[in-house]
Amino acid sequence: FPQDRPFEDTCHGNPSHYYDKAVRRCCYRCPMGLFPTQQCPQRPTDCRKQCEPDYYLDEADRCTACVTCSRDDLVEKTPCAWNSSRVCECRPGMFCSTSAVNSCARCFFHSVCPAGMIVKFPGTAQKNTVCEPASPGVSPACASPENCKEPSSGTIPQAKPTPVSPATSSASTMPVRGGTRLAQEAASKLTRAPDSPSSVGRPSSDPGLSPTQPCPEGSGDCRKQCEPDYYLDEAGRCTACVSCSRDDLVEKTPCAWNSSRTCECRPGMICATSATNSCARCVPYPICAAETVTKPQDMAEKDTTFEAPPLGTQPDCNPTPENGEAPASTSPTQSLLVDSQASKTLPIPTSAPVALSSTGK
């Protein structure tokens, strides 16, 4: 089209723009390493950093790993997008008891309202079932239809929860079981006997609890016994031990009857953000042994930025380019500023001997 020619010509003399025939207009040329957010970018703000698959660009313009929903009790709510993380939620029939960023750290099965109570609000992915006392005239044993039926095949019968009485409300929520395959299998073997005075065949109200063993003769060891991978917490509840299954974690102490497993970052890494009994974010230890550092003389007085290397690698201990900028990286690890200025040293703790100091002692 002849009328388009002048527009095309205006682009040729401008290296920061190009002509897009499909849309018949001048477009802004994104700088190397940046990618357009639309077909024909008009300005620098229409360009963005491109992250690797399963990473997204966070508010601080950093490529950050999307959370994974690979646990059995989680499902994907929203996918990993270029500018937002994947979001996970508890699978149907479960609710989140301990939330985590864009996910849930711990899911429990929804409670079934016990005799004398009816469902006030059904459970959701975020909230447990809320029960309230049945209206007068309803038989307590059949206050809710579920309590008058044997579980049909294909459904997971729930453990009868211990009622909770909040001070401010007559309604109550009752967590039932830990959200693991183990818990599901255990739950499927249980049946409720709402009217039976005996506790035989009735599951414990604690998540992860298995029936207590009778005391061995002459033994005082009659403690509550939790299922494998659960421990008895200070409040006497069976609680799931943390898992060290992430690639960057190793087991520090095992799951015991009265204490959780604890995890730590594998050797060569340091915990940048902790979590209960574990580390939420491990990063490669960002400082090289003093004797491996090479520093050109013209950089002796400069601050240098090192990017912590991706998981599974060690810092290469070489300074970054002359401008002191770290190379762009899509690694989720945190970058750390290095100041080359030498200073006096503190001594080593007797309880923690370390490698040679820079003095060679």
Epitope: T262, C271, A290, I348, A352, V354, S357, S358
Partner: nanobody, 122 residues
Framework: EVQLVESGGGLVQPGGSLRLSCAAS????????MAWYRQAPGKGCELVSI???????YYTDSVKGRFTISRDNSKNTLYLQMNSLRAEDTAVYYC????????????????WGQGTTVTVSS
């Protein structure tokens, strides 16, 4: 036994400055790396900065250019100079010896000292 005592915290307005100190005792001759960690209310323990035995220093992105870590062997003391403070810097700050060895688990807050509280609020 290694003992660390943190001090210097307080209430400061956004944009203000504080200097934290960590007095160390129970050490032998040479200098390990030392670290500052912090724990905000309801959050996990977070690495802030490391200083190596030979004085090289490391900072997390969020404090880069605002905080300065230093050490003085003659006084057996570690410092953290905090400038341009923000509300998100509100936390209890802890120092930790030899983080390469001691801070692989999520337990580098409160293991050696009681910490010092920094509150940034207008």
């Amino acid at each position: 036994e290694v003992q660390l005592v943190e001090s210097g915290g307080g209430l400061v307005q956004p944009g203000g400055s504080l200097r934290l100190s960590c007095a160390a005792s129970g050490f032998t001759d040479d200098g390990p790396d030392m670290a500052w960690y912090r724990q905000a209310p309801g959050k996990g323990c977070e690495l802030v900065s490391i200083i190596s035995a030979d004085g090289r220093t490391y900072y997390t992105d969020s404090v880069k250019g605002r905080f300065t870590i230093s050490r003085d062997n003659s006084k057996n003391t570690l410092y953290l100079q905090m400038n341009s403070l923000r509300a998100e810097d509100t936390a209890v700050y802890y120092c930790a010896p030899d983080p390469r060895r001691n801070c692989r688990g999520g337990d580098c807050c409160g293991n050696w000292g009681q910490g010092t509280t920094v509150t940034v609020s207008s």
